[in-house]
């Protein structure tokens, strides 16, 4: 019963976690622009990993996608190659665990290859997880050092009289959706493991083994004393499945109409 | 068509308060921000606030915090802008102005103006 | 806040001449998230509201003629009236559109010489 509720837990938590890494790769809002002190702005940046929008005061929101491949920096790429990674992880594994649930029965499926694909899902699901962090991270240290930088010249041509002022960026939502999205694929993952553990059958085959005495034949069954003396066998059917086929998901986002005042 | 028609000419007396109204028709109120310009005569224009008609969400200049107030009735598509404590130099032409939507911040309708006259 | 400096104060120009006003801003004006420049020119007759021309530094505004135009990028920005018409006598002004508090020019007297 425990491992059932392990397992679905698991299963759901990994749901979640891995629509949030959809939502969190599809947002806009992976860095917003920064506001100082000022809580409103005429004009409002925001970028997501496919395109950049402006909100103006007015409401009105203009996106612009990425079109190109070789023009973005090599880290975005890196972000982008991470959250898809973990995406299409994230997508088998609950492929693989819908068929893995105890609650579910497809044919004659033993709990041996039920076991197994609960341990390969919890897998895929820890990766993905993983993946979804390294990804959100990456693209987190990317906004700090260049939050810095553009904060060290903040100001061009402090010498005359025109000043550029620098658009700085801090963290958007996105980042925040991943992190937790991430967080929650891993637990799932780690509970899906755990499930397995308790899905496994524990076989004990105790072989009898005769000794031959001079007089006499006696059978003895060796029991409480096999782990010490080397007799029976005490086996765990364990195999571990390295799933794998990757599919490309198409990432769309839609602009969102945001009056800021 | 659009037309912004705001209240009529106003004479108040120093350290009195204001309140010029602007009523919107031809377009869908809510969906277009508003805002109040005024111009002292033979000056330039001087951006005041802004309000949000949908949300009633008010955004004001520095210089006239405290002093100005933004409302909107939305059952009579009117907006109504106050100032209190005036002084003779906020003797001007006040101006309702809406934002085009997709203008990049410009304003594409103006109310014909109501002139406030501080005197003593 | 963003100062916005137009030049000349005001301009004599026979008609069908052209007419240029020039506006300098303190601050760019010019958004890198959409490569776009936030500022608006405005044509204001004695007793008259203001009336918009030009928004994104230049785009015409449905219904004005084409013989208004505007240039410009970042800080310096161009209104040109190509050929002067009698109606065009007026006072001209910019607009800063990219951060509160929005302001605007001095302003450009326009007459004919």
């Known amino acids: 019963m425990a491992v059932t509720a392990c397992q679905g837990l698991g299963f759901v938590v990994s749901l979640i976690g891995i629509a949030g890494i959809i939502a969190a790769t599809c947002m806009d809002q992976w860095s917003t622009q920064d506001l100082y002190n000022n809580p409103v702005t005429a004009v409002f940046n925001y970028q997501g990993l496919w395109r950049s929008c402006v909100r103006e005061s007015s409401g009105f929101t203009e996106c612009r996608g990425y079109f190109t491949l070789l023009g973005l920096p090599a880290m975005l790429q890196a972000v982008r190659a991470l959250m898809i990674v973990g995406i299409v992880l994230g997508a088998i594994g609950l492929l693989v665990s819908i068929f893995a649930l105890k609650c579910i029965r497809i044919g004659s499926m033993e709990d041996s290859a039920k076991a197994n694909m609960t341990l390969t899902s919890g897998i895929m699901f820890i990766v993905s997880g993983l993946c979804a962090i390294a990804g959100v991270s990456v693209f987190a240290n990317m906004l700090v050092t260049n939050f810095w930088m553009s904060t060290a010249n903040m100001y061009t041509g402090m010498g005359g009289m025109v000043q550029t002022v620098q658009t700085r960026y801090t963290f958007g939502a996105a980042l925040f959706v991943g992190w937790v999205a991430g967080g929650l694929t891993l637990i799932g993952g780690v509970m899906m493991c755990i499930a397995c553990r308790g899905l496994a059958p524990e076989e004990t085959n105790y072989k009898a083994v005769s000794y031959h005495a001079s007089g006499h034949s006696v059978a003895y069954k060796p029991g409480g004393f096999k782990a010490s003396t080397g007799f029976g066998s005490n086996t765990k059917n364990k195999k571990i499945y390295d799933g794998g086929a990757r599919t490309e998901d198409e990432v769309q986002s839609y602009p969102s109409k945001h009056d800021y005042v | 068509q659009v037309q912004l028609v705001q209240s009529g000419a106003e004479v108040k007396k120093p350290g009195a308060s204001v309140k010029v109204s602007c009523k919107a028709s031809?377009?869908?109120?809510?969906?277009?921000?508003m805002l109040w310009v005024r111009q002292a005569h033979g000056q330039s224009l001087e951006w005041m606030g802004n309000?949000?008609?949908?949300?009633?969400?008010?955004y004001y200049a520095l210089k006239f915090q405290g002093r100005v107030t933004m409302t909107v009735d939305r059952s009579t598509s009117t907006v109504y802008m106050e100032l209190s404590s005036l002084r003779s130099e906020d003797t001007a032409v006040y101006y309702c102005?809406?934002?085009?939507?997709?203008?990049?911040?410009?304003?594409?309708?103006w109310g014909q103006g109501t002139l406030v006259t501080v005197s003593s | 806040d963003i100062v916005m400096t137009q030049s000349p104060d005001s301009l004599a120009v026979s008609l069908g001449e052209r007419a240029t006003i020039n506006c300098k801003s303190s601050q760019s004006l010019f958004n890198s998230g959409n490569q776009k420049n936030y500022l608006a020119w405005y044509q204001q007759k004695p007793g008259q509201p203001p009336k918009l021309l030009i928004y994104g530094a230049s785009t015409r505004e449905s219904g004005v003629p084409d013989r208004f135009s505007g240039s410009g990028s970042g800080t310096d920005f161009t209104l040109t009236i190509s050929s002067l018409q009698a109606e065009d006598v007026a006072v001209y002004y910019c607009?800063?559109?990219?951060?509160?508090?929005?302001?605007f020019g001095q302003g450009t007297k326009v007459e004919i010489k």
């Open positions: 309000i949000n008609p949908y949300y009633g969400r008010t």
């Open positions: 607009q800063n559109a990219h951060s509160y508090p929005y302001t």
């Open positions: 102005a809406r934002d085009g939507y997709s203008l990049r911040n410009a304003m594409d309708y």
């Open positions: 031809g377009y869908t109120f809510t969906d277009y921000l």
